[in-house]
Amino acid sequence: QKSSIEKCSVDIQQSRNKTTERPGLLNCPIYWQQLREKCLLFSHTVNPWNNSLADCSTKESSLLLIRDKDELIHTQNLIRDKAILFWIGLNFSLSEKNWKWINGSFLNSNDLEIRGDAKENSCISISQTSVYSEYCSTEIRWICQKELTPVRNKVYPDS
């Protein structure tokens, strides 16, 4: 049995997958900040987790996915105010009893040191210094991401 949060996450991800492929993104759009091979957008308003997920989708992006501790630290360095929390794209899957990224992969337990409980209706937020489990209904800010397309040199066969 999937929770409403899980259903929302799956629905939005599926609708994103159905959209036609867009040309690769070579530069970050206006208002987005580049962090390595990603463009990040930090909200100024607050929302529960599922509304944050939906907002990123309307911006042709997704809630932030963090690959490893190094990326976490670099993202946290962009947060200017100690007191502010931001939703990322990770929530607790009741059916699988594990933290699950919105792309369907599970959290590697070494990647993030989460403060708080792993339980139903829990979603993950980050601050300047920490990673927290919060009720998904909590209204906080959020971070959207777009992936930049790596520029590769085209190789043409001899004519």
Epitope: I30, H44, L78
Partner: antibody, heavy 121, light 108 residues
Amino acid sequence: QVHLQESGPGLVKPSETLSLTCTVSGGSIISYYWSWIRQPPGKGLEWIGYVYNSESTYYNPSLKSRVTISEDTSKSQFSLKLSSVTAADTAVYYCARDGGIVGLTAAFDIWGQGTMVTVSS
Amino acid sequence: EIVLTQSPGTLSLSPGERATLSCRASQSVSSNYLAWYQQKPGQAPRLLIYGASSRATGIPDRFSGNGSGTDFTLTISRLEPEDFAVYYCQQYVNSPITFGPGTKVDIK
């Protein structure tokens, strides 16, 4: 009540660098985009660029090679430098708070009163 | 670059009349990131509408915006004497941010 105030010389010689500062009072400079916009006499508005959280900037491509926008959060100020000016850069220069696409505010919701800069020898 | 075209260039009306100003974009303004500003002589522009239809703080409800994609309108339901000014539309989703050339609303 957030208030913006531009300051800087009203006359700049051709080929020199135009330098303006915008002081933000009555609110935080952190986590907003801060833009510069200009308006030549009797003409329309042209966006120059913004600074965000000190290290992030975005400039109008038509001016990019000549523009630097920076932020000093400790003084609640952000600045514009426009190099190699010509008479075509004569305009009223406005600073503005820019809500971007992320917030309670959006677009340019608070403006300074503007400062006239003339480029002439 | 998104080019914004405003029409008419000048609108001559009397107080109490309805004003309808048009703004057309050269390409779609995604998520309706379009704003309207009012500017009076010697003053900075003032934000009226953002997100195509949301009124900015303190703006009277006689001002309304709508439209999507490439066609947007600003309507002033009943012109007050203080509404005679130049009105600019602006898109803020693509770089560079661009403004329309303006529509002047003057007294007939």
